[in-house]
């Protein structure tokens, strides 16, 4: 059974959170998909998704978040710029299949930003402040409204935590084993 | 021990197919991505693809769409990698590489296997 | 895709030189590069990540420098164990690609 995981990211302001969701490239590869933020007790909210059809690795930016589909490789490359405190929370891609309900990808990111300068040994001082150059032809997309009511009958864990669940389906209920994530810049 | 061990060297005719396995030991295997590099003698290195042993999810590079397949069996913490439609030009050492977390834009290799040479020659 | 050229393809050094290896990539990388060595019938090894971030266990006299386009990396007093290939590798868009590599050799 593949395990949904929740993984933990620690960074300081300014800096830029880096990752990437997986998907079955045959299903999804001209899927829309979206990033959205899980609030305790809230529906999760769309803060940016890729056009309808999604156009391979062509760089959606709606704010400080960036979007790029790798539609031949099955990777939806995230990255929030310039990281404030208040970006802290549990994010999580999706990808849209209407009339269907948005199809939850792995792995869910657990985000939390402080302020000061990361002087954590392993992280790239060097790049903490990058400013990602992102080509003029970058498109802002509209994303769909609705969301998934199966993603909003309980509230997600809060701790950092591998769940188990069987291939495709979601089941936040058995919470096992915290896992820690090194700082990533 | 930190490690990644794979299968023994291979001799094919063209047209037929291979199999590498790569058995990973010392860490959470479905923590991180698996990757496929492979080297032609006295030649640079060649990105294939990448696993996600967790999801089972792959990507390959356009050069290999369609003719390689990536696979894990995570019972046994292994990554296979199979190439059909062999030719003379396949010939090369392929190594399976340990990248970032699952999660992480962080595609460095920081752990290799030994590599497995495959000789395709009628 | 991003193209790597790296320069030379080879060198021969004297044992003590200071060894300087280009990479230059086709376009911006943000930073996303990493340095490997590979010694004959040995499987490559990753130095140096993200430009200038040593790997664990990685002795000090290697290092590395750049931004943009332009990257280099540095031996700072060549030693015979030193003797190898030497690959960059960027990871800002896939697919990955490496450079050709630079062959180091000992006069």
């Known amino acids: 059974a593949t395990k949904l995981t929740e993984e933990k990211y620690e960074l300081k302001e300014g800096q830029t959170l880096d990752v990437k969701c997986d998907y079955t490239l045959e299903k999804f590869a001209s899927s829309q998909k979206a990033w959205q933020i899980i609030r305790d007790g809230e529906m999760p909210k769309t803060l940016a998704c890729t056009e309808r059809p999604s156009k391979n690795s062509h760089p959606v930016q709606v704010g400080r978040i960036i979007l790029e589909d790798y539609h031949d490789h099955g990777l939806l490359r995230v990255r929030m710029v310039n990281l404030q405190v208040e970006d802290s929370g549990l994010y999580q891609c999706v990808i849209y299949q209407p009339p269907k309900e948005p199809h939850m990808l792995f792995d869910r990111i657990r985000l939390v930003v402080t302020k000061g300068f990361s002087g954590t040994p392993g992280s790239n001082e060097n790049s903490t402040q990058n400013v990602y150059k992102i080509p003029p032809t970058t498109t802002k997309a509209l994303c769909p409204l609705y969301t998934s009511p199966r993603t909003v009958t309980q509230a997600p864990p809060k701790s950092t935590a591998d769940v188990s669940t069987p291939d495709s389906e979601i089941n936040l209920t058995n919470v096992t084993d915290i896992i820690r994530v090194p700082v990533f810049n | 021990q930190v490690q990644l061990v794979q299968s023994g060297a291979e001799v094919k005719k063209p047209g037929a197919s291979v199999k590498v396995s790569c058995k990973a030991s010392g860490y959470t295997f479905t923590r991180y991505d698996i990757n496929w590099v492979r080297q032609a003698t006295g030649q640079g290195l060649e990105w294939m693809g990448w696993l996600n042993p967790n999801s089972g999810n792959t990507g390959q590079t356009q050069k290999f769409r369609g003719r390689v397949t990536m696979t894990r069996d995570t019972s046994i913490n292994t990554a296979y990698m199979e190439l059909s439609s062999l030719r003379s030009e396949d010939t090369a050492v392929y190594y399976c590489a340990r990248g970032g977390y699952t999660s992480a834009w962080r595609w460095y290799f920081d752990l290799w296997g030994r590599g497995t040479l495959v000789t395709v020659s009628s | 895709d991003i193209q790597m050229t790296q320069s030379p393809s080879s060198l021969s050094a004297s044992v003590g030189d200071r060894v300087t290896i280009t990479c230059q990539a086709s376009?911006?990388?943000?930073?996303?590069l990493n340095w490997y060595q590979q010694k004959p019938g040995k499987a490559p090894k990753l130095l140096i990540y993200d430009v200038s971030n040593l790997e664990t266990g990685v002795p000090s006299s290697f290092s590395g420098s750049g931004s943009g386009t332009d990257f280099t990396f540095t031996i700072s007093s060549l030693q015979p164990e030193d003797i190898a290939t030497y690959f960059c590798q960027q990871y800002d868009k896939l697919p990955l690609t490496f450079g050709g590599g630079t062959k180091v050799e000992i006069k």
């Open positions: 376009q911006d990388i943000n930073n996303h």
